[in-house]
């Protein structure tokens, strides 16, 4: 792929920043080395540039190719390589650049931690919220549904915006927005439950902006194994934030003596993080790390983007696989603590629960396991992929497939072990979840490989939408429905309460196997789709007036 002047602007014609236009004009005149207006080497001090060593450049997938030579600064030629060696040109300092990009990735990951911390702080004090507002279980379900639905609906909108406008501004505004809404929601009077519902919907919109756009910035800051590592860190924020959310919720409530204060912690941190994003995250141009030039302006419509994504088989199959993961995590997260409590009732090691919270201890253990396995899974997945890439080009989807299929076995074993040993069940949960979570970062990486930079935010958004729609938006309810259906046809006893929920949860490993199959299908098309994406990026970087993608 050809190194042009620098990673470049947005599709759809809207510029990343007004300043970029001025920078580009200056760059075309006289290009400078590191610390200048920024060529391939740097984007100003601490910017997110990508260094060019001679005329060797990195492609979309991070592989190294020789760039064709030509007059410096000419569109379609490696102007950077030539000018970087020119008289008086300073070579970029990779260490400081790495630090700048590392700091940006760290801030984005911190933002993701806060996203989930905020979401799960509410989960941590949900019983208090229910008690205070007099919320019935169906009302608590409504809070969850409104959040997920607004998140789902908002994600594609932010995907569209994220591919066309200044991403860090959208990110910061999203964080400021949900922070303000969450903070305000801590003051909602008892009689206005509907305002609480509305606030959760608004928080869903705010958080959708972040979940959709942040990974694409990381995708534009790094390539290959570094990108996998950074996405791993970013996605480890999910279990970390979730765990911290539960801890924050309960500990702040205990310290302040009032659950309302629990909702005031994440907004304060959110405001700080939003400000840090504005200051420290560079306004990376799409495809920056992929060495794309100023000509990368895919002026394609949202409809054409969607058509292209639906035709991208690797993307479609990996999205369906992600939905399977989401289905399983959503269902297991909601029902496993209660299932294990019922197992203990059957084993006569616990009393039948008549007054909630039922299985509070199991919820705590399960939360801790989820937090740790999230970390372990992300690390294991990233490590395994890194190693497998040395053996095969299809490493990413294959590691995911093996993780999913292995996970299905251990999820099945949970229900076998639970009948006789709770410890055994927890071990199976531990291994099963580790394998299940091993594909989080890799799936994001697959998307970065097979989707061109100007469509990534839309792709992440659509994937988020489908994974919620087909996954955790309905799975907890479906499991509950199946369990009730089984229980209606059996005699009323603690044993059948346990068995009916177990049989219903057995749907999860089957869905996980299906997800594994989808990853195997992804592996079939991965290499060709990746090559096609690189080819499209080459076309985008070419000088012709109109580029059809």
């Amino acid at each position: 792929m050809m190194c042009l002047e620098c990673a470049s602007a947005a599709a759809g014609g809207a510029e990343e920043e007004e300043a970029d236009a001025e920078r580009r004009r200056r760059r075309r005149g006289a290009q400078r080395g590191a610390g200048g207006s920024g060529c391939c080497g740097a984007r100003g001090a601490g910017g997110a540039g990508v260094s060019a060593a001679g005329d060797e450049v990195q492609t979309l997938s991070g592989s190294v190719r020789r760039a064709p030579t030509g007059p410096p600064g000419t569109p379609g030629t490696p102007g950077c390589a030539a000018t970087a060696k020119g008289p008086g040109a300073q070579q970029p300092k990779p260490a400081s650049l790495g630090r700048g990009r590392g700091a940006a990735a760290a801030i984005l990951s911190l933002g993701n931690v806060l996203n989930y911390l905020d979401r799960y702080t509410v989960a941590g004090v949900l019983l208090d919220i229910q008690q205070h507002f007099g919320v019935k279980d169906r009302g608590a379900g409504l809070l969850q549904s409104v959040f997920i639905c607004s998140f789902m609906v908002a994600a594609p909108i932010f995907g569209y915006l994220g591919d066309r406008f200044n991403r860090k501004v959208i990110l910061s505004c999203g964080i400021f927005f949900w922070s303000a809404v969450t903070f305000s929601s801590s003051f909602i009077p008892q009689q206005y439950f509907w305002l609480l519902v509305l606030s959760r919907g608004l928080v869903g919109i705010g958080e959708a902006s972040y979940s959709t756009i942040a990974p694409t910035i990381i995708g534009d800051l790094f390539t290959k194994n570094t990108r996998t590592l950074m996405l791993s860190v970013f996605y480890f924020a999910i279990p970390l934030g979730s765990g911290l959310g539960y801890i924050t919720g309960s500990s702040v409530k205990q310290a302040a003596g009032d659950w309302h204060w629990a909702l005031r912690v994440s907004p304060v941190l959110g405001m700080i993080t939003g400000t840090l994003i504005l200051i420290l995250v560079p306004a990376t141009k799409r495809g920056h790390a992929d060495q794309l030039g100023d000509q990368l302006k895919a002026r394609t419509s949202w409809l054409r983007d969607m058509k292209a994504l639906i035709r991208n088989r690797s993307y479609v199959f990996s999205s369906l696989a992600t939905s399977a993961v989401s289905f399983a995590t959503g269902a297991l997260g909601m029902w496993i603590p209660l299932y294990l409590h019922r197992a203990q009732v059957v084993q006569k090691t616990a009393e039948t629960c008549n007054s909630p919270p039922c299985g509070a201890k199991d919820s705590l253990i399960f939360g801790a396991i989820t937090c740790f396995t999230g970390f372990l899974g992300v690390v294991t997945g990233a490590g395994a992929t890194r190693w497998c890439r040395l053996k095969t080009q299809r490493a990413d989807p294959l590691v995911c497939a093996v993780g999913m299929l292995g996970s299905a076995i251990f999820i099945c074993l949970i229900f076998v072990a639970a009948k006789s040993s709770i410890v055994g069940a927890y071990i199976c949960i531990f291994v099963g979840e580790t394998l299940l979570f091993s594909n989080w970062a890799i799936t994001a990486d697959i998307l970065m490989y097979v989707v061109i930079p100007t469509r990534r935010a839309t792709a992440v958004a659509l994937q988020s939408f489908t994974s919620h729609l087909l996954g955790d938006a309905g799975s907890p309810y479906l499991i509950g429905f199946i369990s009730d259906l089984i229980r209606q046809s059996t005699k009323d006893s603690p044993l059948w309460e346990f068995l009916s929920l177990g049989y219903a949860l057995m749907l999860c490993p089957f869905v996980v196997v299906l997800g594994g199959m989808f990853f195997l299908a992804t592996a079939l098309f991965f290499v060709s789709d990746r090559a096609r994406a690189e080819q499209q990026v080459n076309q985008l970087a070419m000088p012709p007036a109109s580029v059809k993608v």
């Epitope: 008690q131 019935k136 009302g139 008892q190």
Partner: antibody, heavy 125, light 107 residues
Amino acid sequence: EVQLVETGGGLVRPGSSLKLSCATSGFTFSDTWMSWVRQAPGKGLEWVALIKDKNSNSEANYAESIKGRFTISRDDSKSRVYLQMNTLRDQDTATYYCTRHEDFYYYSGYYFDYWGQGVMVTVSS
Amino acid sequence: DIVLTQSPPTLSVTPGESVSLSCRASQGISTSIHWYQQRSNESPRLLIKYASQSIAGIPSRFSGSGSGTDFILSINRVESEDFSVYYCQQTYSLPLTFGPGTKLEVK
């Protein structure tokens, strides 16, 4: 029209038991939270116990003064709420009111929008 | 537990006068206060919910105000049927508690 009718009161000795019953009509009982509130002769009102609907797992809450001695329960098929009172004391002497909490489908108010006529319970040796 | 204090314990007024009954909470309870009227030998009835929200069937002369810790029940031009005991109740947190009551009597 909403109606709450309490029965089961009377004169009992300290340490004995009594079960109050409240028959309801005029609203969807299974979706509604119910409470018992008492009033000692010449004194103010005191909340005793609350039972939520099945959509809240029929969770029960009690005042500290009666916790462990009184049990609130409900029978949705009969639209009735009960208060089982064990180990009765002199200070439990009061008029016991069956009350209804206003319902909003997704949530419920903790205030009492309808009250029964009350039933007298006298604990005396 | 949240303690509610009502003042004055007894209030003597002549019919046609306007009165204000006070209820103070031991901690901030937003607007989670409700007012009841109990006539002699009758069951209580709900007058005002959430500090200021009116109830269907209750005369418009009854109104409520306040937030946080201090609340007022106002009766505009007292009528003969209004002479009874008034209780405030908090629902901010369990256990649900009532104030000791204010008795409104004829002067």
